[in-house]
Amino acid sequence: AGVFELQIHSFGPGPGPGAPRSPCSARLPCRLFFRVCLKPGLSEEAAESPCALGAALSARGPVYTEQPGAPAPDLPLPDGLLQVPFRDAWPGTFSFIIETWREELGDQIGGPAWSLLARVAGRRRLAAGGPWARDIQRAGAWELRFSYRARCEPPAVGTACTRLCRPRSAPSRCGPGLRPCAPLEDECEAPLVCRAGCSPEHGFCEQPGECRCLEGWTGPLCTVPVSTSSCLSPRGPSSATTGCLVPGPGPCDGNPCANGGSCSETPRSFECTCPRGFYGLRCEVSGVTCADGPCFNGGLCVGGADPDSAYICHCPPGFQGSNCEKRVDRCSLQPCRNGGLCLDLGHALRCRCRAGFAGPRCEHDLDDCAGRACANGGTCVEGGGAHRCSCALGFGGRDCRERADPCAARPCAHGGRCYAHFSGLVCACAPGYMGARCEFPVHPDGASALPAAPPGLRPGDPQRYL
């Protein structure tokens, strides 16, 4: 178990021409807040994939009012870190989405209004317990600067938070075969229940006797880097079973290389061979290159041969954004007939048909809805001789002519907070609830008769998949 921490340093106009207008004005003062969504692994991001590692919302930032005539400065930020607790092993590789939201504080009917200002996404490798990694991401004309790290919650330690520490039984030394627990030198490593010999740096287990490898490592004991099949250390007696050399004690013990780097000895000390995307003496500095696969949805990465040069994602048809993370509106192909309104739902195209028409592409004439006009993309729904308008998100009333706050219907259950923007609704759940609408109380294992989860339990729930 542990916590992913995100520190936002600045959010403001990026370099170059086309500086964005300030999101706030004297008439509409506003303040910012941020949402982070974490997913495990480097797999392509599914359009509706949940924030399976967890999600978090920041506090609101200070109220900001634009000074007339002044360029948009870096905007005032919320205090503190965004913290996403994770319960299982830290996966080592993860995808993130960071959203910048604006809360307008003008004379809004029904309270403040929220809108999404910018959204950045990326994929990174990160070892728990390492230093802060710095990053810069751009979304349109906006630039977001931030740092992040993953740290283990005691008693867990290690790059995946899978090793356990416990207080020393004697003040002088740890028990037989147990090492001091860096960085908690006054504690000792708890006996591992993993398979004997399983690498404490590169392997972990969720059940006794198994040895599962972090990305970049292989072999029955997770001691072999994926990049090479030969052994790294030239010392020690030969092992007949693997043909490898078993290292004795040396400067590489405990692997000082972060982020999956492999250690080799030098005459004076050690040297880290870093995976692509990381550099520095101990591979502690992260820089993203094309080799890290930063382009989502099959995008082609160009440039970025070294971490200091930028990469560019050339997106396939249907996707856009600096990381090809946004879907292009496929409705430009005009698939809806008879004047139907096309909606791109991500996983499918949908046609909202004009009154009198129905079918997946509005190809069928209907009598029940003839002469019945639903405005703003509403659909006339017929059934049993009756007909009504089923309104698109954000509209209501008999003919869908009235603007409606999607959150006014209170879709979030059990005290969840609702946020609305162009692609749908977001529910931020209160502790102890899960589901996109926070509709399910979490019942911890073996306690299914309880009415809800105990206070303070935070499920790593998908919430809404933006």
Partner: antibody, heavy 122, light 106 residues
Amino acid sequence: EVRLVQSGAEVKKPGASVKVSCKASGYTFTDYYMNWVRQAPGQSLEWMGIINPYQGDTSYNQKFRGRVTLTVDKSASTAYMELSSLRSEDTAVYYCARYHYGPHLEGYFDVWGQGTTVTVSS
Amino acid sequence: DIVMTQSPKSLAVSLGERATINCKASENVGYVSWYQQKPGQSPKLLIYGASNRYTGVPDRFSGSGSATDFTLTISSLQAEDVAVYHCGQSYSYPLTFGQGTKLEIK
């Protein structure tokens, strides 16, 4: 093709436990909640519970009073439903069903397993 | 728990004719989904969000209603539509279903 394939029929004695498996394929297992729904002979559908396959968080129908346990094996893309202290009225077909959300956050079961018949008889 | 009541319990309709099944919730559920279950098979999704037809479902199936009263309509009954139809609500925990409506050919 998205598929949920369940384990075979089971015959159990009253008081015993049964564990039914549901193997998912054709999609990323951890991207969708998994539900369990049962149907007794000649009866309607009855929701038993839901699990978040990545975190393992669960929510159960109180009717089952702690008798049901939902688990997953992420590496095998498989969900499990264990029902203990079986009685004759637990004789039913047990289904796993993937949970999906529409644009207004309306939840629905879009893919169902083929069902596993559990017979409880002395 | 929210009680979902379907009517009628069984229904016989001639081929090509319209079939209508109702579902009433004991309190506001916002929307329902409809499932078709043929003999010996698992349920299949037809309609979600009260009126959205699921991918691949023929357009003779339509759903309507809101709050507590919902309707599934088959505009022109086909032989392959013989099945039990279930409504279900996912608005409120615990999720609940109607008792089912058996549709046959007259």
